[in-house]
Interface confidence: medium
């Protein structure tokens, strides 16, 4: 599923991401835009043999199990394929664990490079939330 901007903002708010660990909803929507272009089925392979999955591009080396990433920790205790569902519950729950891990949203390279320090509220402007 490819979400609309406001549609995703509403879904993320429903799942409790607004101000989760101090990150406003705009940060999460911005991250999803530049990680996956709002596409729940996005997959991208990394040079270390791992793969990033879903709307927030969660990595198989640390967070989920895709059955083929050497040394996978699976800290979210889920199959990576669950992160590709049109229902973003699994991605959000795992993202909450990631953002609580110490580095905050710096764990997402796209957020760090494209969202951090910008007017992230623009990503939810005009949305009825």
């Amino acid at each position: 599923k490819v979400f609309g901007r406001c549609e995703l903002a509403a879904a993320m708010k429903r799942h409790g991401l607004d101000n989760y660990r101090g990150y406003s909803l705009g940060n999460w929507v911005c991250a999803a835009k530049f990680e996956s272009n709002f596409n729940t089925q996005a997959t991208n392979r990394n040079t270390d043999g791992s793969t990033d999955y879903g709307i927030l591009q969660i990595n198989s080396r640390w967070w989920c199990n895709d059955g083929r990433t050497p040394g996978s920790r699976n800290l979210c205790n889920i199959p990576c394929s669950a992160l590709l569902s049109s229902d973003i519950t699994a991605s959000v729950n795992c993202a909450k664990k990631i953002v609580s891990d110490g580095n905050g949203m710096n764990a997402w390279v796209a957020w760090r490079n494209r969202c951090k320090g910008t007017d992230v509220q623009a990503w939810i402007r005009g949305c009825r939330l």
């Epitope: 043999g49 059955g67 083929r68 050497p70």
Partner: antibody
């Protein structure tokens, strides 16, 4: 136990297309990548690409882009590979395998012969 | 693409001999190297994964070693059922690639 059952041998004419199937049993089909591998005598084993059945995400070896197309049907736990514009170079044994990085589970292979 | 070069191409041995098969990668692949056995008209069978981990049901006479670019599959006291082709494969990067194979034949 994990099993991959491939469709039977095919004899096709040059220019035609063929669709090979790979039915998976014994595990959660949508969760694991399915890989496709080509074997020709004297050419060893070649990785064609992969599909994640749960999402339909696909990756292809550049060499096989435009030649192979992967699909999957999660209702029947079956992955498919279509090969188009067949030539004699496509005559080979084609295997599906469960994509665990290493391939511990293989289909029995489908022999494709392309001949006029 | 990562090239895997296997040597020798053919190895002629007598049952009871111990042998080593080599696989060399064109660049470092860490420990993401796997070994397969293939007998005529059969599918490949995983022997060793991640350089040295035995696959389930594989006899203990098969072992693997190496790191980076140079890897070895060793068979301690070859049995008649071991004759066939052996392939290495890397899963360090895409596309996945296989070595050209070593044929283990009876002398």
């Amino acid at each position: 136990q994990v099993q991959l059952q491939e469709s039977g041998a095919e004899v096709m004419k040059p220019g035609a297309s063929v669709k090979i199937s790979c039915k998976a049993t014994g595990y959660t089909f949508s969760t694991y990548w399915i890989e496709w591998v080509k074997q020709r005598p004297g050419h060893g084993l070649e990785w064609i690409g992969e599909i994640l059945p749960g999402s339909g995400s696909t990756y292809y070896n550049e060499k096989f882009k435009g030649k192979a197309t992967f699909t999957a049907d999660t209702s029947s736990n079956t992955a498919y590979m279509q090969l188009s514009s067949l030539t004699s170079e496509d005559s080979a044994v084609y295997y599906c395998a469960r994509g665990d990085g290493n391939y511990g589970y293989w289909g029995q292979g489908t022999t494709l012969t392309v001949s006029s | 693409d990562i090239e895997l070069t296997q040597s020798p191409a053919t190895l002629s041995v007598t049952p009871g001999d111990s042998v080593s098969l080599s696989c060399r990668a064109s660049q470092s692949i860490s420990n993401n190297l796997h070994w397969y056995q293939q007998k005529s008209h059969e599918s490949p069978r995983l022997l060793i994964k991640y350089v040295s981990q035995s696959s389930s049901g594989i006899p203990s006479r098969f072992s693997g070693s190496g790191s980076g670019t140079d890897f070895t599959l060793s068979i301690n006291s070859v049995e008649t059922e071991d004759f066939g082709m052996y392939f290495c494969q890397q899963s360090n990067s895409w596309p996945r690639t296989f070595g050209g194979g070593t044929k283990l034949e009876i002398k």
